[in-house]
Interface confidence: low
């Protein structure tokens, strides 16, 4: 940042789209900004405006291409720059030689589905998004269940140090509606961190069979 | 036009430290990477690291402990220090940019400032 | 490290010959460069990505190859192309060079 009191974060989704907030104590809201992409060694820049999201932070996702084409390696640089419009002229705010592959952060999981479901357990599946290949299996996954009663924030998580796109729940009680998300990190990246949670998925355990013991 | 002139070559002891510097004019480093390449008398060339526009680094392995790259925006200028050096490092040092579609190889080069570590 | 290999270290050819260098990395690569350097002077870039031609460079020097394995040709050497040739990867850190071809004249 160009100053103490500006903010530059971006992440790269490992595919196809870097995605920046930028904060500034004072910034005026009207401002015009952008941030612009300059990679070291692609023929093409990329830029995307950046839009409020709160009193004094702005953000923005560049599209670097379809969603699911490889765009960037784990030895490219993008210099990312805040640029804000000061009358006829352009201001640079803040700058970053970016590394997309120390700055990751996954698309949510999606296309989560209830495999199977009995009383006490359920196994549930879902899919990556525009993960790159790059990963191989070198990824890991929370997931976190919602029992009645509780918050997202007191469910426990489970972690799977795999690539293992599937979960048996045990230990469930009959007849009783659960919510179920999942989250992905790729294990490479010092600046890496864990995507979005996935779209809850809502599931009931079957209830238990009448006249037997649960 | 785009031009690197290296300079800050010479004789150097070993064990001692040197101090490269590269002026760039036809462009800004606040918008180009900077690297630098040496070569051996007689030999091949060798990448030593790059600084980028935005002034971080990256370094070959084989010198990170005894290398740094810096620069000053407003001199338009990159430097290049190592220290602890010694005989092998006998070399012309070059520093080199990559072309106008900011990346196309090192289209740009200076023209090499030769150091002898000897005593 | 990614090791390149180019060969031969050495060729002598006549003017008016077709000149062929390889250049076999010991991993594959995506961008793979070739300069020019003549004696006492700097390197000059003659290929980029693999097959491209520099600014200014003649079309008598093309370059193609993928993977492992590259090749760059001179399809009728001329005088002024007495020089050493080197392959360069940009596809991992540290950018590392071949050990260069030497090309003389008969």
């Known amino acids: 940042a160009v100053n103490g009191t500006s903010r530059f974060t971006c992440f790269y989704n490992s595919r196809a789209n870097i995605s920046c907030v930028w904060s500034q104590d004072g910034a005026l809201q009207d401002t015009s900004c952008q941030v612009h992409a300059w990679p070291d060694r692609r023929r093409w820049n990329q830029t995307c405006e950046l839009l409020p999201v709160s009193q004094a932070s702005w953000a923005c996702n560049l599209i670097l291409g379809t969603p699911d084409s490889q765009k960037l390696t784990a030895v490219d640089i993008v210099t990312l720059r805040v640029m804000c419009r000061e009358g006829v002229r352009w201001r640079m705010m803040a700058i970053q030689d970016f590394k997309p592959f120390e700055n990751l952060r996954l698309m949510a999981p999606i296309s989560l589905q209830v495999v199977h479901v009995e009383t006490h357990r359920c196994n549930i599946s879902w899919k990556i998004s525009q993960a790159s290949h790059y990963f191989e299996r070198h990824l890991e996954f929370e997931a976190r269940t919602l029992s009645p009663g509780h918050t997202w924030e007191e469910a426990p998580l489970m972690t799977l140090k795999q690539k293992q796109e599937w979960i048996c729940l045990e230990t469930l009680t009959p007849d009783t509606q659960y919510e179920f998300q999942v989250r992905v990190k790729p294990l490479q990246g010092e600046f890496t961190t864990w995507s979005p949670w996935s779209q809850p998925l809502a599931f009931r355990t079957k209830p238990a069979a009448l006249g037997k013991d649960t | 036009e785009v031009q690197l002139l290296e300079s800050g070559g010479g004789l150097v002891q070993p064990g001692g430290s040197l101090r490269l510097s590269c002026a760039a004019s036809?462009?800004?480093?606040?918008?180009?990477?900077v690297h630098w390449v040496r070569q051996a008398p007689g030999k091949g060339l060798e990448w030593l690291g790059v600084?980028?526009?935005?002034?971080?680094?990256d370094y070959n392995a084989a010198f990170i402990s005894r290398l740094t790259i810096s620069k000053d925006n407003s001199k338009n200028t990159v430097y290049f220090q190592m220290n602890s050096l010694r005989a092998e490092d006998t070399a012309v040092y070059y520093c080199?940019?990559?072309?106008?579609?900011?990346?196309?190889?090192?289209?740009?080069w200076g023209q090499g400032t030769l150091v002898t570590v000897s005593s | 490290d990614i090791q390149m290999t180019q060969s031969p270290s050495s060729l002598s050819a006549s003017v008016g010959d077709r000149v062929t260098i390889t250049c076999q990395a010991s991993q594959s690569v995506s961008f793979l460069y070739w300069y020019q350097q003549r004696p006492g002077k700097a390197p000059r870039l003659l290929i980029y990505d693999t097959s491209n031609l520099a600014s200014g460079v003649p079309s008598r020097f093309s370059g193609s190859g993928s993977g492992t394995s590259y090749t760059f040709t001179i399809s009728s050497l001329q005088p002024e192309d007495i020089a050493t040739y080197y392959c360069?990867?940009?596809?991992?850190?540290?950018?590392?060079f071949g050990q260069g071809t030497k090309v003389e004249i008969k």
């Open positions: 036809g462009f800004t480093v606040t918008s180009y990477a």
């Open positions: 080199a940019r990559a072309g106008d579609a900011n990346y196309d190889g090192f289209a740009y």
């Open positions: 600084i980028w526009s935005g002034g971080s680094t």
């Open positions: 360069q990867q940009w596809s991992t850190y540290p950018l590392t």
